[in-house]
Amino acid sequence: FKVATPYSLYVCPEGQQVTLTCRLLGPVDKGHDVTFYKTWYRSSRGEVQTCSERRPIRQLTFQDLHLHHGGHQAAQTSHDLAQRHGLESASDHHGQFSITMRNLTLLDSGLYCCLVVEIRHHHSEHRVHGAMELQVQTGKDAPSNCVVYPSSSQDSEQIT
């Protein structure tokens, strides 16, 4: 399986909310001994590998933000903890999972990573990640709504 990031860059005004999205692609083993662990964290474009370092998102670690379930079941993180920090991560039945950040500030700018771990309990873990950039802008040059740039090209779309 692979992880796709529909958008590689999100440019948002301060105070807005944004939903960063990843999508699980390819055949997914739905056997009873295969489970999926999904999470989000901030990182950097490191010298060795992008997304290898795991930094908190608004003080919440990747442990706090994880989603756990088998196959394509829907799941959500612990509501109370995340919502206190203006965050919510969720997953649907179709392999799409996301993190929503409310009331964006300049401090939210940076590289965000989604991580999917396919756990085959008597064999190994298979991990795949996706990366995307969030730029929060303020002032007269800031867009009125979030503008997203698809990963495959530089055409932009405005999200209202």
Epitope: T35, S52, H68
Partner: antibody
Framework: QVQLQESGPGLVKPSETLSLTCTVS????????WSWIRKPPGKGLEWIGY???????NYNPSLKSRVTISVDTSKSQFSLKLSSVTAADTAVYYC???????????WGQGTMVTVSS | EIVLTQSPATLSLSPGERATLSCRAS??????LAWYQQKPGQAPRLLIY???NRATGIPARFSGSGSGTDFTLTISSLEPEDFAVYYC?????????FGGGTKVEIK
């Protein structure tokens, strides 16, 4: 802050079954792998196995025929049973939280189990 | 199973000196390697994950490097509390395995 605490008898007779329980406090047991690791005197660390929150288990092949790990989510506990013990099973036994694609990040303080008649 | 060999078995150094610990895997573990510190009577403590990332709260004097089969843990300037046993551990597949440990002792 998640904390782990092992409990169980410190002395077990040869050929009997070693039984230990790990109590998880300060967090949910309904996530992650919950593992057992041991350290025999003068030796290194040995992974025994884990139970995933979903109930799936995975054991070290060297111990698989003698090991059972179970979980009681209602009590926030998971347990280790090791049958037909010998003196070679004398060790400090640790329970630990293991996060997928990460590491064993939280450990209990360990409990010494001696196998002797 | 993957065998991890640590060297040296014992490292005798003075506070303030640099410690270099090695861990070699019997086959590639990519960068899926962790380092732990264990002091007498205590549980192991996670220092480094994924070969080179410091765990939360670990001082900057600890650093990890390497990938594939050869890994290094470096303590840039030993503090009195750093004298302990250090273990590497792989997680590219099960069973999880640990190295035999390197004891860093006061010279």
């Amino acid at each position: 802050q998640v904390q782990l605490q092992e409990s169980g008898p410190g002395l077990v007779k040869p050929s009997e079954t070693l039984s230990l329980t790990c109590t998880v406090s300060g967090g949910s047991i309904s996530s992650y792998y919950w593992s057992w690791i041991r350290k025999p005197p003068g030796k290194g660390l040995e992974w025994i196995g884990y139970i995933y929150y979903s109930g799936s288990t995975n054991y070290n092949p060297s111990l698989k025929s003698r090991v059972t790990i179970s979980v009681d989510t209602s009590k926030s506990q998971f347990s280790l049973k090791l049958s037909s013990v010998t003196a070679a099973d004398t060790a400090v036994y640790y329970c630990a939280r293991d996060i997928p694609a990460f590491a064993l990040d939280i450990w209990g303080q360990g409990t010494m189990v001696t196998v002797s008649s | 199973e993957i065998v991890l060999t640590q060297s040296p078995a014992t490292l005798s150094l003075s506070p303030g000196e640099r410690a270099t610990l090695s861990c070699r895997a019997s086959q590639s573990v990519s960068y899926y390697l962790a380092w732990y510190q264990q002091k007498p009577g205590q549980a192991p403590r996670l220092l480094i994950y994924d070969a080179f990332n410091r765990a939360t709260g670990i001082p900057a004097r600890f650093s990890g490097s390497g990938s594939g089969t050869d890994f290094t843990l470096t303590i840039s300037s030993l503090e009195p509390e750093d004298f302990a046993v250090y273990y590497c551990q792989q997680r590219i597949n099960w069973p999880l395995t640990f190295g035999g440990g390197t004891k860093v002792e006061i010279k």
